[in-house]
């Protein structure tokens, strides 16, 4: 069930087909009739024209497409979670800071997960860029630490309280996605009711030496314009109607009824069509492109 791009909205598609059918009839100007019907209908809705769906047509992250295709072709690979949300890095202005071989990348995520869902697993996915001399065969060996930036009070106002979420070593020979388990933190965020969270990724050389040109560089791709923007992937389980949802989902995948992401509610978690699709289809993948800033 490979996913193609989303060019034409279902509403526009339906209207054009409707028009073609009527215009084939002789003796009646059905285009005019159709237009007047459309105008009347829009008038009752207090609209001047059919609302454009451009805002809903957000390109889903590459990884979310991969996940859907993976689960559609191999149902045994499906996790116990029935909802997968993707949250993009919202910090589009901060630049990485470098000194003494240490680089810091600020990230910002607006995460909302309903309280009735159980968070099964959460991953921070970072695209690591390995930059090295092609003549050097060795890869790049680095330590990566993910911090949550907290708050300070009183005399410590200038200091940023930091909490290590996960730390690990990366040996990179090629640019690729790296995954970090942040399940505990996401569960805490969900239960605490806070949604805006600042993270900071630290990359340092493994042996505390300053980076030199020969050892190569390892960076995180944080540019918002490409498909490698840092992602927070949250696998959760909506336990309100588990059995019913699983049956519907299996049916949907086996019959390949949902070739388009629009029908999966991938366009937006909190905007109309996506939410409606989610409720009706009990889809298992949601691409959350909205920004809800709340503390």
């Amino acid at each position: 069930s490979p996913i193609m791009n989303l060019e034409q909205s279902p509403l526009e598609e339906d209207m054009s087909l409707f028009g073609d059918v009527f215009s084939e009839q002789d003796g009646v100007d059905f285009n005019t009739l159709l237009q007047s019907m459309k105008d009347e209908f829009l008038k009752t809705l207090n609209l001047s024209d059919i609302p454009t769906q451009d805002s809903a047509k957000v390109d889903p992250p590459e990884y979310m497409l991969e996940l859907y295709n993976k689960f559609a072709t191999d149902r045994t690979s499906m996790p116990s979670a029935n909802i997968i949300r993707s949250f993009k890095n919202e910090d589009l202005f901060s630049q990485p800071v470098s000194f003494n071989g240490l680089r810091k990348y600020p990230l910002l995520f607006n995460v909302s997960i309903p309280h009735h869902e159980e968070v099964i697993m959460a991953e921070l996915r970072l695209y690591t860029l390995v930059q090295r001399d092609r003549m050097i065969y060795d890869g790049v060996d680095r330590k990566i630490t993910i911090f949550e930036v907290l708050e300070s009070k009183g005399d410590n106002e200038g200091e940023r309280n930091m909490l290590v979420l996960v730390s690990g070593e990366i040996y990179g020979t090629n640019s690729e996605w790296e995954t970090f388990d942040v399940t505990d933190a996401i569960r805490r965020w969900q239960k605490s009711g806070s949604s805006t969270h600042q993270l900071e990724v630290h990359i340092e050389s493994k042996h505390d030496e300053a980076e030199d040109a020969s050892s190569g560089r390892l960076e995180i791709d944080t540019s918002a314009q490409n498909k490698h923007n840092p992602l927070l992937i949250v696998f959760s389980d909506d336990q309100s109607s588990d059995k019913e949802r699983k049956e519907e989902l299996n049916e949907m995948i086996s019959h390949e009824q949902l070739p388009e992401l629009d029908n999966l509610g991938l366009d937006s978690f909190s905007s109309g069509p996506g939410e409606e699709a989610l409720l009706q289809m009990r889809s298992n993948i949601i691409y959350d492109s909205t920004a809800r800033i709340r503390r």
Epitope: K143, N156, V164
Partner: antibody
Framework: SLEESGGGLVQPEGSLTLTCIAS?????????MCWVRQAPGKGLEWIAC????????TYYASWAKGRFTISKASSTTVTLLMTSLTAADTATYFC?????????????WGPGTLVTVSS | DVVMTQTPASVSEPVGGTVTIKCQAS??????LAWYQQKPGQPPKLLIY???DLASGVPSRLSGSGSGTEYTLSISDLECADAATYYC???????????FGGGTEVVVK
């Protein structure tokens, strides 16, 4: 494991350096090394933390700033320099390790070293 | 500054009973709360972090709950080995005040 040393009797207004040595592991990214103290019969009081990674960023309780200095002496040793000591600083000083810069969630502790400030 | 208020200061319960200790923060600490157990002459031992997550090796008789400013530690099926002083600690703020609560002494009869 962690082990503190350097405690003992010190005169008021005097100075003392406490040492925390890690065995079976060396300091690296991913956690903070901290000092916490406990006056006799009293509760726990956070003093300071230092990041074990290369940045070595330090954090202090506001009351400890200026008089206490935490530092990384080596890949297995953290020290706490205490100056202008008073009787109120008499306590058992613990070295501990955790993921929070504020000394949060300290999962590994040393047995402590007793500091007595008295003339 | 954030102040952690722990109640009661002392509690006595029989073996097999249940003890509940409360910890109140003067501000929302977003579930960044830990509980420690300390016995005389020993360093503290981490029991619970992030309000409800059990540290490694801690029995499920202990449980933590709460959010916002109100948190609770419960110990059920009390054993003699549970006799100790218990402390809560907030981790959300680097505070000028005490990040630890004042402690609760648990006596098992």
């Amino acid at each position: 494991s962690l082990e503190e040393s350097g405690g003992g009797l010190v005169q008021p207004e005097g100075s003392l350096t406490l040492t925390c040595i890690a065995s079976a592991f060396s300091f690296s990214s991913g956690y903070y090394m901290c000092w916490v103290r406990q006056a006799p019969g009293k509760g726990l009081e956070w003093i300071a933390c230092i990041y074990a990674g290369s940045s070595g960023t330090t954090y202090y309780a506001s009351w400890a700033k200026g008089r206490f200095t935490i530092s990384k002496a080596s890949s297995t040793t953290v020290t706490l320099l205490m100056t202008s000591l008073t009787a109120a600083d008499t306590a058992t000083y613990f070295c501990a390790r955790g993921p929070g810069a504020s000394g949060y969630r300290l999962g590994l502790w040393g047995p402590g070293t007793l500091v007595t400030v008295s003339s | 500054d954030v102040v952690m208020t722990q109640t009661p200061a002392s509690v006595s319960e029989p073996v097999g009973g249940t003890v509940t200790i409360k910890c109140q923060a003067s501000e929302d600490i977003y579930r960044l709360l830990a509980w420690y157990q300390q016995k005389p002459g020993q360093p503290p031992k981490l029991l619970i972090y992030d309000a409800s997550d059990l540290a490694s090796g801690v029995p499920s008789r202990l449980s933590g709950s709460g959010s916002g400013t109100e948190y609770t530690l419960s110990i059920s099926d009390l054993e003699c080995a549970d006799a100790a002083t218990y402390y809560c600690q907030q981790g959300y703020y680097i505070s000028g005040g005490d990040s630890f609560g004042g402690g609760t002494e648990v006596v098992v009869k």
